[in-house]
């Protein structure tokens, strides 16, 4: 069975899925569409790296440009750097900007809902 | 066949508030993001916001400042959006119009509803 | 917001003629986020072009859309009867959506 005959099979369970089980399915080629990643948990979407997402998304990761204002895209692209985002090519803007640190406080990530940024 | 059937034409007083339903049929409902797009008498489009039928997630076009609230029902496949604090500028012909998620056109159109604030 | 300039505004052929219409960004837009929609009198939208160049389904080969960063065209190879109508180009680039203020294409 092939990566997106796999997803096809999986597709309704995914709603609840936690972050290692998306980290796998970036591994399988499943080609994701943007509906079904519209449907993730914000807080299982969050920890994933850019790379993650697109291999997770494969040629739908153009999609994630339409959805930057929806969650959990926007939750998404708030935690990623800036740098990393621009390797995709797809514009997508709102990243921590270079030179910046993240600090993983989770108290004051909680209280606010963005990450805490020390500047250069 | 892919369907969005908007509601009736309205007439409103400035001040008060209108709320226009789009009802869709022939597809999977919660695939599709639906926009909302205006058109003043012989002006042309304007985008004021889209929701995600799926999450109920929203997003407005700031000029609208707080005037404007898309909300769904996908039990009915309805979404609707509600324009408040009206003024003889928003007279208009409200378009819903279906997009898919992932994408930023707009591939399917309801036939219109047509707004129009007078005292 | 980003301002999306179409010219001419009114542009005056006969049927048979080739139509160029123009959509010019304030700033760049890419490529994919660009699309044209037809509407004819009370009528809704309808999607010609999505992507700047990829016909909608069901839209005759005669039209075509070219163009990168802020200059954009919409062609009409050899108008139909059926082809007059307003036009109007999109960008979804950058927020908020906006939309061009249109070119009538009219039977001259």
């Known amino acids: 069975m092939n990566g997106s005959e796999y997803f096809v099979k999986i597709q309704s369970f995914l709603g609840g899925a936690p972050t290692e089980d998306l980290k796998a399915l970036s591994q399988q080629n499943v080609s994701m569409d943007l509906a079904t990643f519209m449907k993730l948990r914000t807080d299982a979407v969050l920890p994933l790296t850019v790379a993650e997402v697109q291999k997770l998304l494969g040629p739908h990761v153009e999609g994630l440009k339409a959805e930057e204002r929806h969650r959990p895209v926007r939750d998404w692209i708030l935690r990623q750097r800036q740098d990393d985002l621009d390797t995709l090519g797809l514009g997508l803007q709102g990243g921590i900007p270079n030179g910046y640190l993240v600090l993983d406080l989770s108290m004051q990530e909680a209280l606010s809902g963005t990450p805490c940024l020390l500047g250069p | 066949e892919v369907q969005l059937v908007q509601s009736g034409a309205e007439v409103k007083k400035p001040g008060a508030s209108v709320k226009v339903s789009c009802k869709a049929s022939?597809?999977?409902?919660?695939?599709?993001?639906m926009d909302w797009v205006r058109q003043a008498p012989g002006q042309g489009l304007e985008w004021m916001g889209d929701?995600?039928?799926?999450?109920?997630?929203?997003i407005y076009n700031q000029k609208f400042n707080g005037r404007v609230t898309m909300t769904e029902d996908k039990s009915a496949s309805t979404v609707y959006m509600e324009l408040s604090s009206l003024r003889s500028e928003d007279t208009a012909v409200y378009y819903c119009?279906?997009?898919?998620?992932?994408?930023?056109?707009?591939?399917?159109w309801g036939q219109g509803t047509t707004v129009t604030v007078s005292s | 917001e980003i301002v999306l300039t179409q010219s001419p505004a009114t542009l005056s052929l006969s049927p048979g003629e080739r139509a160029t219409l123009s959509c010019s960004a304030s700033?760049?837009?890419?490529?994919?986020?660009l699309s044209w929609y037809q509407q004819k009198p009370g009528q809704s939208p309808r999607l010609l072009i999505y992507?700047?160049?990829n016909l909608a389904s069901g839209i005759p080969a005669r039209f075509s859309g070219s163009g990168s960063g802020t200059d954009y065209t919409l062609t009409i190879s050899s108008l139909e009867p059926e082809d007059f109508a307003v036009y109007y180009c999109?960008?979804?680039?950058?927020?908020?959506?906006?939309f061009g203020g249109g070119t009538k294409v009219e039977i001259k």
């Open positions: 999109h960008q979804w680039s950058s927020f908020p959506y906006t």
């Open positions: 700033s760049s837009v890419i490529s994919s986020y």
């Open positions: 992507r700047t160049s």
């Open positions: 119009a279906r997009r898919r998620i992932g994408t930023g056109y707009f591939d399917v």
């Open positions: 929701i995600n039928p799926s999450t109920g997630g929203t």
């Open positions: 022939g597809y999977t409902f919660t695939d599709y993001n």
